[in-house]
């Protein structure tokens, strides 16, 4: 049958639209299916019908059940069913699956999270937004009309987002909350011939003898997850591991994702207690992926 699931929390407003929609001029009659009892249209009732809408102000657990709406045009009567479930408020922060609206996916370019069902309500901005029950704060989060925008979306922005707003009916205010999951998807990935961001080719770095210094090799390989992408240092054309000088150590490469979505890797070469002989070495920053190898050379000079 033509039915739709609706759910809400006790002591909150719940407004349900007849799944069988018609013109606004069509008459809609609502019934409680179990008893075939007509739902009143007078607004003084806690539960009342208002055209296409059935309003629970506020909802109670006992309101759960199937409601029938019959939409009447001049020549046709069409029936819909609203399956309404009202749940008790959860004592802890967890939002169970049965209270979740459809999951939405976002990416760096598109990070809108719409507040579910809000169009049915008489609400005024701004909305309050929570992630995993924590109020969202900071300039990255912008509550705009009926949706939340997240700037520079990252994978750890995934989670359960709850919008909270006030429905106003004849001067009385009722709270409404709705929760949906947000997942972050990679934009379509691709790989490029490596691009070394630092150091510049044939760069010279001034250092103090006896001091410590760091050299950073930073290279980008495309967008999204990369199958093969390595960044490493060589000394006079030899691997660091083959160069038996404990003062010179290479850190494990750190993955980095920039706001433009580029997948980059940084590898730091740490030189402790710089000596005269270090100035004679050639330091090669190597970036390698399936497309090939790129090398930038840097030398050290005395300050």
């Amino acid at each position: 049958k033509f039915s739709k699931q609706s759910w809400g929390l006790e002591n909150e407003a719940l407004i349900v639209r007849c799944p069988r929609q018609g013109k606004s001029s069509y008459i809609v009659d609502w019934y409680y299916s179990q008893t075939n009892k007509s739902i009143p249209t007078q607004e003084r009732n806690r539960v009342f019908a208002s055209g296409q809408l059935l309003k629970f102000l506020p909802a109670e657990v006992a309101d759960s059940g199937i409601y029938t709406c019959i939409v009447r045009s001049p020549t046709f009567n069409r029936t819909g069913y609203a399956n309404v479930t009202i749940y008790k408020k959860q004592p802890d922060c967890n939002v169970p699956d049965y209270l979740m609206y459809s999951t939405v996916s976002g990416s760096e370019k598109n990070s809108k999270i719409y507040c579910p069902t809000i169009d049915l309500y008489n609400w005024t901005a701004p909305l309050e937004w929570f992630k995993n029950c924590q109020a969202l704060q900071g300039s990255r989060y912008k509550a705009h009309k009926s949706f939340l925008v997240i700037d520079n979306v990252m994978t750890d922005d995934a989670g359960d987002y709850t919008c909270k707003f006030i429905h106003n009916e004849n001067g009385a205010n009722y709270s409404v909350t709705a929760t949906r999951s947000f997942t972050v998807k990679d934009e379509q990935g691709f790989s490029l011939f490596p691009v070394i961001r630092a150091p510049a080719h044939n760069e010279t770095k001034e250092v103090e003898i006896g001091e410590n210094t760091n050299l950073t090799c930073s290279a980008c390989f495309g967008k999204g997850a990369q199958f093969l992408a390595t960044v490493q240092w060589q000394l006079n054309g030899n691997k660091i591991t083959d160069f038996s000088e404990p003062r010179i150590q290479q850190e494990e490469g750190q993955n980095q994702s920039f706001s433009n979505g580029l997948a980059c890797v940084n590898t730091v070469l740490r030189i402790a207690d710089v000596k005269e002989e270090d100035l004679l070495l050639r330091y090669d920053c190597l970036a390698l992926n399936l497309h090939g190898l790129r090398r930038h050379t840097i030398r050290l000079s005395r300050k």
């Epitope: 033509f2 929609q21 013109k23 045009s73 046709f76 069409r78």
Partner: antibody, heavy 123, light 107 residues
């Protein structure tokens, strides 16, 4: 009494054009979705196009998209189907029909039909 | 698009007999399904809408049932004027589609 009367059918060569009209009476034409459905000789019914009521959108079957244009003149209570680049497989009786429910983005049954106009595409 | 398959293609029955026509959808159409009757040289006539509701003026011997993908049109006792071709139509979304038709002929 609701009445729909199609006209404009006839014989046309492949690649040619034809404009069908459907004159409506007996109801408030402007608020209803209107539809063209065709039936090739000895075959079943095929939906061709829908135009929504009250300035709504237009919808086309893939087989006619880019060649046929549905339109309406609410002041004349008339529905049109402009058919260009006609092919032999467009040969059919073309019916205009009314969708009595007419809500945005949804479709319903066809409660009143015209008697149809025959379009023959042949060289 | 949603494909509607009607069976049988032809049904040979005598007046007074019960006719059972089937329409199967390639995916669920909820109850957004209609049945039409078409006689030679005439336009189709709406019989049933929303799977089971009779249109205005349709005799009680016509009834529809089903939901989702499987639907049935039943004519409880065939009258001479019921011999015709019957089409099902879904309207859950664009493009609306019709079945290929079932011809009910006199045995």
């Amino acid at each position: 009494e609701v009445q729909l009367l199609e006209s404009g059918g006839g014989l046309v060569q492949p690649g040619g054009s034809l404009r069908l009209s459907c004159a409506a009476s007996g109801f408030t034409f402007s608020i209803y979705d209107m539809i063209w459905v065709r039936q090739a000789p000895g075959k079943g019914l095929e939906w061709v196009s829908t135009i929504k009521g009250e300035g709504g959108g237009t919808y086309y079957a893939d087989s006619v998209k880019g060649r046929f244009t549905i339109s309406r003149d609410n002041s004349k209570n008339t529905l049109y189907l402009q058919m260009n680049s006609l092919r032999a497989e467009d040969t059919a009786v073309y019916y205009c029909a009314r969708d009595p429910w007419s809500t945005e983005g949804s479709f319903f049954v066809l409660d009143y039909w015209g008697q149809g106009t025959l379009v023959t595409v042949s060289s | 698009e949603i494909v509607l398959t009607q069976s049988p293609a032809t049904l040979s029955l005598s007046p007074g007999e019960r006719a059972t026509l089937s329409c199967r959808a390639s995916q669920s159409v909820d109850d957004d399904l209609a049945w039409y009757q078409q006689k030679p040289g005439q336009a189709p006539r709406l019989l049933i809408y929303d799977a089971s509701n009779r249109a205005t003026g349709i005799p009680a011997r016509f009834s529809g049932s089903g939901s989702g993908t499987d639907f049935t049109l039943t004519i409880s006792s065939l009258e001479p004027e019921d011999f015709a071709v019957y089409y099902c139509q879904q309207y859950i979304g664009a493009p609306i589609t019709f079945g290929q038709g079932t011809k009910v002929e006199i045995k």
